[in-house]
């Protein structure tokens, strides 16, 4: 019985060249989180955070992805190509898998506001 819910930062925007925090939070369950995976819109893996062994950032993203805060992920030196969907996948025991979605829009404008609020998808 999966009782938990994933809260995410929902739809967010940030300016080109800047950085943004992708954050998900699992609530309403006592399940043990064994691993969190962060994926891009094309399902390529950005990073994983294994409960026992810590962070693993994929080589292709090592220069632009920083682990944290917490189970979140920080994307740096944003480009227009970073616009799109991002997914957090929480592998838990005994519940199973929870998945959250974030949409990031990278803006050219120097006045782009970094907007983020937690949402339940």
């Amino acid at each position: 019985m999966m009782t938990g819910t994933i809260e995410t930062t929902g739809n967010i925007s940030a300016k080109k060249g800047g950085s943004v925090i992708l954050q998900c939070h699992l609530s309403s369950t006592m399940a043990q989180v064994t691993q969190v995976n962060w994926e891009q819109h094309d399902h390529s893996l950005l990073a994983i955070r294994n409960a026992e062994l810590g962070w693993h950032i994929y080589p292709a993203f090592k220069d632009r992805v920083a682990p944290g805060p917490g189970l979140g992920l920080t994307l740096q030196s944003l480009t227009m190509n970073d616009t799109g969907e991002y997914f957090c996948t929480y592998h838990t025991y005994p519940d199973g898998t929870y998945r959250g979605r974030i949409f990031l829009e990278v803006l050219e404008s120097s006045v782009a506001e970094h907007s983020a609020r937690f949402q339940i998808p």
Partner: antibody, heavy 122, light 107 residues
């Protein structure tokens, strides 16, 4: 193709330490965790621990905590397992085994080394 | 830790026989179960992951089923190369734990 080549058989005295190596080839070394599993003569499989070759972080089975150390050398794509304070019950074949999938890391092993027999005898 | 109990510990069978091995977990593990085959003097070989997913190159006479706490490995028609020891392993959480093994012997 994926290959894990382990060091040769060892004979050790009780109280000594042994260090077994496992050289990986045929895949990106830092992309897969590595397990160590042992098997005493005529017995079943016993998981000892796991290491992340990228970060070097480890998780050991409680039974071996304080006696086992797993390390890696990314320049040679080699992982090591050192077991100290050896006793006769540690006589076993020691296997390194590559983790199956980092998307679900630490779950199961798909490629195994040929095994290293460690004999502890006075 | 999750305990894995396999039965029987050994089974005698003939070529062509159907062989069934069972594995029970001490707590629910959904479908996170693997089966390995080991021949004397050799390293274990992964046969099945996720309770029923056959690894590439594994003959279709092998099948796995089950979910939760009770799992089964079936060899539909035993071949000479299938005489070996089989181990189940829970694959849901560290520490990894194995069943005690089932030796399939020639009758």
């Amino acid at each position: 193709q994926v290959q894990l080549v382990q060091s040769g058989a060892e004979v050790k005295k009780p109280g000594a330490s042994v260090k077994v190596s496992c050289k990986a080839s045929g895949y990106t070394f830092t992309e897969y965790y590595m397990h160590w599993v042992r098997q005493a003569p005529g017995q079943g499989l016993e998981w000892m621990g796991i290491i992340s070759p990228s970060a070097g972080s480890t998780k050991y089975a409680q039974k071996f905590q304080g006696r086992v150390t797993m390390t890696r050398d990314t320049s040679t794509s080699t992982v090591y397992m050192e077991l100290s304070s050896l006793r006769s019950e540690d006589t076993a074949v020691y296997y390194c085994a590559r983790d199956h999938d980092i998307r679900l890391a630490g779950r199961l092993a798909d490629y195994w080394g040929q095994g290293t027999l460690v004999t502890v005898s006075s | 830790d999750i305990q894995m109990t396999q039965s029987p510990s050994s089974v005698s069978a003939s070529v062509g026989d159907r062989v069934t091995i069972t594995c029970r977990a001490s707590q629910g593990i959904s479908s996170w179960l693997a089966w390995y085959q080991q021949k004397p003097g050799k390293a274990p070989k992964l046969l099945i992951s996720a309770a029923s997913s056959l690894q590439s190159g594994v003959p279709s006479r092998f099948s796995g089923s089950g979910s939760g706490t009770d799992f089964t490995l079936t060899i539909s028609s035993l071949q000479p190369e299938d005489f070996a020891t089989y181990y189940c392993q829970q694959a849901v959480i560290l520490p990894i734990t194995f069943g005690g093994g089932t030796k399939v012997e020639i009758k």
